[in-house]
């Protein structure tokens, strides 16, 4: 089921899947002076079985000629819920994401693709949140958030991440000194997920991918 | 392994309160929304209401306003049931659970053993 | 409050034979989003309700497939191709589709 909400925002911080749930949908968006090709896919698909996920559809672009401006890809009324926009980012897997049941690897680009991704999430997908460069994250917990429902109502879970200015020392009361990268996360919050859900595949892979994924952005 | 394991049994005297646990372990709360449901002796199941451990959001059944509180603490991984104003009406076993999903399930996939409040005149 | 109605209250079988539970609405519980969250649970004597069928006809992981679920708008019904003595308690219906949300008055499943 689709999440009806953008995940939260984060004053001077973005967030990243690591691995799309099946049902996510990615919109064909083209760069200025370029439009979908007619009869091209509206939308890719995160689909699968048991053991493969992938993405269904390709995204084609192809030259407006004559018009010079962006072709809106404009979902069906039940799939307009969830127009999340993330900017473009290089496709860099730092680990197999294929590889995680139910879920598909970040689409690589294609030709002529929109600056920014509008991805339509569904329920159970897990982001994670980085500083941009210049901030430096003060955890009060896990830098995540899961888009969690109950009968229909969908809401994303807030990220206990603050992105404070490279030379603000101040601290929040209690609050232990931040560390250098943002990849710290509490031990007790990685051993307490024992969980057998999809959630607890994200959550420690994002312990481990955490540091590589968010420091190769920065190289 | 998922679990919920709920508090004892009660006790508790008839115009008294009592606070109910559920500690739930193999996952953390704040990543589910927490139901809690009556079952009277003998009788069939009614919800009491949810509540989202991250925020600390409720929505309660019209019937159970007023008569419960659900709150949740997520630093030991605990939701509770106040139940105030104490009457024979409210003598039942009190179930807590969660709203589980997947990629191809949800539904109340998780329940607590249940906790027998006696409320006795 | 939608109002979810059982029937039969109480349902003697013979071990083997098919079983047949309906459910029926007050009202129609297609949620606003198109999903119809209509739920069966089984609960043993002494036990905590599982869950058996989520969202109409879908099994829950674990549970045999002689259990099917079927219906919509305001009409549903919960069938077991062939009892087996694991299968006797209490069903319940539940519809989450509405604030609040309801049970069934439940349906006593048990041996002629």
């Known amino acids: 089921e689709l999440c009806d909400d953008d995940p939260p925002e984060i004053p001077h911080a973005t967030f990243k899947a690591m691995a799309y749930k099946e049902g996510t949908m990615l919109n064909c968006e083209c760069k200025r002076g370029f439009r979908r090709i007619k009869s091209g896919s509206l939308y890719m698909l995160c689909t699968g079985n048991s053991s493969h996920s992938s993405w269904d559809n390709q995204c084609q672009c192809t030259s407006s000629a004559t018009r010079n401006t962006t072709k809106q890809v404009t979902p069906q009324p039940e799939e307009q819920k969830e127009r999340k926009t993330t900017e473009m980012q290089s496709p860099m897997q730092p680990v197999d994401q294929a590889s995680l049941p139910g879920h598909c690897r970040e689409p690589p680009p294609w030709e002529n693709e929109a600056t920014e991704r509008i991805y339509h999430f569904v329920v159970g997908q897990m982001v994670y949140y980085q500083c941009v460069q210049g901030y430096r994250a003060l955890h009060r917990g896990p830098a995540e958030s899961v888009c969690k429902m109950t009968h229909g109502k969908t809401r994303w879970t807030q990220p206990q991440l603050i992105c404070t200015g490279e030379m603000e020392t101040s601290q929040f009361p209690g609050e232990e000194k931040p560390q250098a990268s943002p990849e710290g996360r509490p031990e007790s919050e990685t051993s307490c997920l024992v969980t057998t859900t999809d959630f607890q595949i994200q959550t420690e892979m994002a312990a481990t991918m955490e540091t590589s994924i968010f420091t190769t952005e920065y190289q | 392994e998922v679990r919920l394991q709920q508090s004892g049994a009660e006790l508790v005297r008839s115009g008294a309160s009592v606070k109910l646990s559920c500690t739930a372990s193999?996952?953390?709360?704040?990543?589910?929304?927490i139901h809690w449901v009556k079952q009277r002796p003998e009788q069939g199941l009614e919800w009491i209401g949810w509540?989202?451990?991250?925020?600390?959001?409720?929505e309660y059944a019209p019937k159970f306003q007023g008569k419960a509180t659900m709150t949740a603490d997520t630093s030991s991984n605990t939701a509770h049931l106040q139940l105030s104003s104490l009457t024979s009406e409210d003598t039942a076993v009190y179930y807590c659970?969660?709203?589980?999903?997947?990629?191809?399930?949800?539904?109340?996939?998780?329940w607590g053993q249940g906790t027998l409040v006696t409320v006795s005149s | 409050d939608v109002v979810m109605t059982q029937t039969p209250l109480s349902l003697p079988v013979n071990l083997g034979d098919q079983a047949s539970i309906s459910c029926r609405s007050s009202?129609?519980?297609?949620?606003?989003?198109?999903?119809?969250?209509l739920e069966w649970y089984l609960q043993k004597p002494g036990q905590s309700p599982k869950l058996l069928i989520y969202?109409?006809?879908n099994r829950f992981s674990g549970v045999p497939d002689r259990f099917s679920g079927s219906g919509s708008g305001t009409d549903f019904t919960l069938k077991i191709s062939r009892v087996e003595a694991e299968d006797l308690g209490i069903y319940y219906c539940?519809?989450?589709?509405?604030?609040?949300?309801?049970f069934g008055g439940g349906t006593k499943l048990e041996i002629k």
């Open positions: 659970t969660v709203f589980w999903y997947g990629n191809n399930y949800a539904g109340f996939a998780y």
């Open positions: 193999g996952f953390n709360i704040k990543d589910y929304y």
């Open positions: 509540i989202d451990p991250d925020n600390g959001e409720t």
């Open positions: 009202q129609s519980i297609v949620h606003s989003n198109g999903n119809t969250y």
């Open positions: 969202k109409v006809s």
């Open positions: 539940f519809q989450g589709s509405h604030v609040p949300p309801t």
